[in-house]
């Protein structure tokens, strides 16, 4: 049986229903069987876990997703083996295997793989700071969301009115969420906001930096 699945990965927002399209062409016999299984990201196909079987005219959802899985067409004998997964969770991200078996049609292995990413908005990030906060020193402001798919990008902004920092004294990494401030001056003091953003939304945290004369540096 030759199975057809989309070549592009599938993305579904948290809590919505994912439709994993799988079609095939075969003269369905009484021995026809369909199995859907799931592999966590980074794991080999051999470690897949079954989530649904169809055989002998009956549907058997199984495993931890059993209450949330169904078939778009039941029985799936018309050439459509599409799986519906409701109320998607972050843990549903991974690879789904659609396997159709219909002896004596052994034209190919009857296997199709679909990568699903559950889209999750960034959680409220945690803002932190380390380094010397005295005049002339350097400090690193860090920002990290524990949740978010795809991985959020981070952008730091300084709130309020302030003199433009000298070039190179403020360098940020959008991927790691780190802002490096060098050659600190008293005017570097203020509130800094980090905004974590992905296609599902954004979340932010703020941190107040107090730059002091040497030997008095601290963060409020």
């Amino acid at each position: 049986v030759e199975v057809k699945v989309p070549t592009e990965p599938l993305s579904t927002p948290l809590g919505k229903t994912a439709e994993l399209t799988c079609t095939y062409s075969t003269s369905v016999g009484d021995s026809f069987a369909l199995e859907w299984s799931f592999v966590q990201p980074g794991k080999p196909i051999s470690e897949s876990h079954p989530i649904l079987y169809f055989t002998n005219g009956h549907l058997y959802p199984t495993g931890s997703k059993s209450k949330r899985v169904s078939l778009l067409q039941n029985p799936p004998t018309v050439g459509v083996a599409t799986l519906k997964l409701t109320d998607v969770h972050p843990s549903d991200t991974g690879t789904y295997l659609c396997q159709v078996n219909n002896p004596p049609d052994f034209y190919t292995n009857g296997l199709g793989l679909i990568n699903l990413t559950v889209l999750v908005p960034p959680s409220n990030p945690l803002c932190s700071q380390s380094g010397q906060t005295s005049v002339g020193g350097s400090t690193a402001l860090r920002c990290s969301s524990s949740e978010g798919a795809p991985k959020p990008v981070y952008n730091w902004v300084r709130l309020g009115t302030f003199p433009t920092p000298s070039p190179g004294s403020m360098v940020q990494d959008e991927v790691s969420g780190q802002l490096i401030l060098t050659n600190l001056s008293l005017t570097s003091s203020g509130t800094y906001r980090c905004v974590a953003t992905n296609q599902m939304g954004s979340a932010s945290c703020e941190l107040t930096l107090s730059v002091t004369e040497p030997s008095q540096g601290r963060v409020a």
Epitope: T23, S25, G29, D30, G57, T77, D105
Partner: antibody
């Protein structure tokens, strides 16, 4: 030699019923998916029913669903099509056809004619 | 449902000529296409399946090509027995549907 012989075609009034038969030989009938395909007076071909090798799965297009029933008797190597609530648009030559491993039709019978008219 | 459209509806040609007819699907059917030949008063006969595979016994002057939504059947060096009607059929998802046919007549 693969052979399929249809029978049972007739002139029927609208709303009537009829059962067609197809006697197969020359191949292992019990291992083959089978279908009925009809050809309307304007020469168009339309698939009307299919059944899996052991009869577990049957499929129909919307045009006949609920009115036509396909069945088989593997002991007699015979395929059937029970038709009810017949309409004038069901007028056609009905062919019995064997399916390949994929759902194309590799052998066809000679056909039997159904005419639905008052 | 997937609609199958054949063109031309009719075609006149002479023995020895080469002809091509086309079949278009309303959506992607990959290579799941069959062609049939039907002579006057006879039942259809399978000519091609999987878009380009010829069953045993079909002469090599017949050839099928295409994938996705566009397909064609070519007959090289027409023989007298090639005249009749030709139908395409998708063998992807149910319902399986046929094109309206191309009638090949002797010029």
């Amino acid at each position: 030699e693969v052979q399929m012989v249809e029978s049972g075609g007739d002139l029927v009034k609208p709303g009537g019923s009829l059962k067609l038969s197809c006697a197969a030989s020359g191949f292992t009938f019990s291992n083959s998916g089978m279908s009925w395909v009809r050809q309307t007076p304007d020469k168009r071909l339309e698939w009307v029913a299919s059944i899996s090798d052991g009869g577990l799965y049957t499929h129909y297009p919307d045009s006949v669903k609920g009115r036509f029933t396909i069945s088989r008797d593997n002991g007699k190597s015979t395929l059937y099509l029970q038709m009810s609530s017949l309409r004038s648009e069901d007028t056609a030559i009905y062919y019995c056809a064997r399916q390949g491993v994929r759902p194309f039709f590799d052998y066809w019978g000679q056909g039997t004619t159904l005419t639905v008219s008052s | 449902d997937i609609q199958m459209t054949q063109s031309p509806a009719s075609l006149s040609a002479s023995v020895g000529e080469t002809v091509t007819m086309t079949c278009r699907a309303s959506e992607n059917i990959y290579s799941y296409l069959a062609w049939y030949q039907q002579k006057q008063g006879k039942s259809p006969q399978l000519l091609v399946f999987n878009a380009e595979t010829l069953p045993e016994g079909v002469p090599s002057r017949f050839s099928g090509t295409g994938s996705g939504t566009h397909f064609s059947l070519r007959i090289n060096s027409l023989q007298p027995e090639d005249f009749g009607s030709y139908y395409c059929q998708h063998h992807y998802v149910i319902p399986w549907t046929f094109g309206g046919g191309t009638k090949l007549e002797i010029k």
